[in-house]
Every structure is written in structure tokens, then in C-alpha cells.
Amino acid sequence: CDLPQTHSLGNRRALILLAQMGRISHFSCLKDRHDFGFPEEEFDGHQFQKAQAISVLHEMIQQTFNLFSTEDSSAAWEQSLLEKFSTELYQQLNDLEACVIQEVGVEETPLMNEDSILAVRKYFQRITLYLTEKKYSPCAWEVVRAEIMRSLSFSTNLQKRLRRKD
């Protein structure tokens, strides 16, 4: 499955939108930094068959979409930027879902690498727990926004590697 060129443009647009979403000076949030334990090893792209890599990417985008679709998120971010960001993520999910169906048929492998999917889910659970503990403060959201930008960058790099394998 070849992810369309529009998919990588969508990735870039999503990152740009996320960068634009900042509402407070992030310099005031230094002490709120937190180790969310991003599962970097799940995104190095070496140990995966393509179908498994795509399913991990799908989970990453799905969880990001879920995180930014909550009421708390709506209260934290400028609405039009948030809607555009969610739309980009939704389009990426559609692209990835189409690819998952194709790849599973080709490789005849299980849909998901369960351990990798679980690692991504636990990562987002830690993010949600952090936001809850910080009472969804502006700085907590800034830290999470920075973290998601970093994790989406890893996702983008994995997608680039997958395209090079084609």
C-alpha cells in the first residue's frame, strides 16, 4: 500500500496546526515538564512488517485524535485551529485504515502487533493521567502539546521510512 502524497502533506499540516495552537508563553511552563515515557522503540520501523507498522501509526493517530476531541481539550484550544487539526488527523486515519486492510491481505499477518499497540495506549493513559493530576491547567496542556508534536514527528519519520521501503 502506498500512502498518498496528500497523507504526508496532512502530517505536515497537522504539525503546523499543533505548533500554532499554543496560547500561553511556554517559557512559564518549564517546571511542568514530565516524562511520559514515549515508546520510541515502537517507532524505529526496523522490527516491524509493514502491516504492523501501519497499525501502530494508526493507533498513535487515533489516540491523538481522541485526546484532542475531549471537552477539556475544546476548552483549552482555539476552536477553529482545533477543528482543522482534528480534520487532518481524521483524514490520516482514513488513509491508514485503507492501508491496513490492503497490507493484511498481502502479508497475511495479524492485524496488530498487540504489544506495540498496548505500549502506545499506555503512553496516552500516562498523558491523560498527567492532565488529570494537573487539573488540565494551561501549562499542562502546553507540555502535552509539545509532547504530541514530538511523538507525531516520530510517526512522520516512520512513515517516511515505510515509503522508502516500497
Epitope: H26, F27, K31, R33, A146, M149, S153
Partner: antibody, heavy 121, light 107 residues
């Protein structure tokens, strides 16, 4: 390979202006902040200020606020430190260093080689 | 501003010695404390970040500990290349501040 390459040594007269540079390579320039640190001859390290190249937001140490200006041009992955009117007391080595921003990663993990600024009449 | 106080300001030690440098913050900084090594004419080098995490490529003889206001950098067995000046730096809030430095000299 991550690198921060600073502009060369400068010799200036009091009252002159100056802009020194720090060019980042080998990483996503807008994903890290760039900090500036002063070291006067035989003295310790002093943090001057920092810039987020993604939006050019800046923060300064109160000691340096109004004395220097930090800027960045993300199109050429370069941060700048400038003076509008140098004083003899600005004679020092100036370092730039990258900072991970709000991410949980090592602070100031890569440094430039330093730019020696000498101000003398 | 958060004041950082290092002690001692200088020390003399021999190769193989265990060396301890302390750093105290004027208010709690949790674990937001970094340690740097600087040799004459060179840029500082990050050794330890977030109080106890060893920076990639730094020898394991270097270790950091502490939280709140009191922190320690330990060199378990001093090597010839370790003679340098060491700085702590709080990473808790702006303005970032450094300790005044500890010069480790050959006895």
C-alpha cells in the same frame, strides 16, 4: 550529526553594534529552543536568554533584558545575539546551546564552540 | 530568581580519588538540575540532567543525586581527563541560573 556553529571572534569599539550568529544543523531547528550563555574572562557561566525558533518567542534573564536582543531566522536555522551599543564590560565568550523546550529530554545537550567578543577602545 | 550555591569552590584530588561536589538551590527545584563539565578554552559539556540521568556518552563514573534543594555530583574514581571546572544549573524556571563553579585540580 548535531552541530551548532557560531560566527567568528569579533573585536569592537565601545558604542558599536554587533550581531553574532549560531547555525544549527543535523536536527529539526524549530523543535528545540536556543539559549545564550555568557562567560566573562576567568569567570563562571551566566544564562542570558533563550528563543523558540518556531515562533521567535523569547525570554531573558533580568540582568540582560534590554541590553541584548535574541532573534532567529528559522529559514536558515540560525539564531542571533545582538547589541546596539557595546560596552567594555561586554568583553566575554558567548555560547549558544540547544534546549529541548517542554520535552523531557536533556537540557543544553549541544553547545556552539563559542564566539569571543572583545570590546576595547 | 533561584540562587544556586556550589561547594567547594575548588578542590585538589588525586587520580583514583572519589570526588563529591554539592549544589544547593535557594528554593525547591524538584529534580530539575543539570551538571556540566568545562575545560579551559572549551564549551561546557552536559554530564547529568534531571539530577541523576547520565547524558549519552558520559562515563559511568559520573553520577548525580538529590532532589528539592540539595544535589550532589560524584566522580567515583577520578581520571586525568576529569580535571576541569564543574557547574550545576537549575532547569526549574526562568531565569535559568548556574552555580559559581567548582574547579577540580590535581593534588
Amino acid at each position: 550529526e548535531v552541530q551548532l556553529v557560531q560566527s567568528g571572534a569579533e573585536v569592537k569599539k565601545p558604542g558599536e553594534s554587533l550581531k553574532i550568529s549560531c547555525k544549527g544543523s543535523g536536527y529539526s531547528f524549530t523543535s528545540y529552543w536556543i539559549g545564550w550563555v555568557r562567560q566573562m574572562p576567568g569567570k563562571g557561566l551566566e544564562w542570558m536568554g533563550i528563543i523558540d525558533p518556531s515562533d521567535s518567542d523569547t525570554a531573558y534573564s533580568p540582568s540582560f533584558q534590554g541590553q541584548v536582543t535574541i532573534s532567529a531566522d528559522k529559514s536558515i536555522s540560525t539564531a542571533y545575539l545582538q547589541w546596539s551599543s557595546l560596552k567594555a564590560s561586554d568583553t566575554a565568550m558567548y555560547y549558544c546551546a540547544r534546549h529541548p523546550g517542554l520535552n523531557w529530554a536533556p537540557d543544553f545537550d549541544y553547545w556552539g564552540q563559542g564566539t569571543l567578543v572583545t570590546v576595547s577602545s | 530568581d533561584i540562587q544556586m550555591t556550589q561547594s567547594p569552590s575548588s578542590l585538589s584530588a588525586s587520580v583514583g580519588d572519589r570526588v563529591t561536589i554539592t549544589c544547593r538551590a535557594s528554593q525547591s527545584i524538584d529534580e530539575f538540575l543539570n551538571w556540566y563539565q568545562q575545560k579551559p578554552g572549551k564549551a561546557p559539556k552536559l554530564l547529568i540532567y534531571f539530577a541523576s540521568s547520565l547524558q549519552s556518552g558520559v562515563p559511568s563514573r559520573f553520577s548525580g543525586s538529590g532532589s528539592g534543594t540539595d544535589f550532589t555530583l560524584t566522580i567515583s574514581s577520578l581520571q586525568p581527563e576529569d580535571f576541569a571546572t564543574y557547574y550545576c544549573q537549575q532547569a526549574h524556571s526562568f531565569p535559568l541560573t548556574f552555580g559559581q563553579g567548582t574547579k577540580v585540580e590535581i593534588k
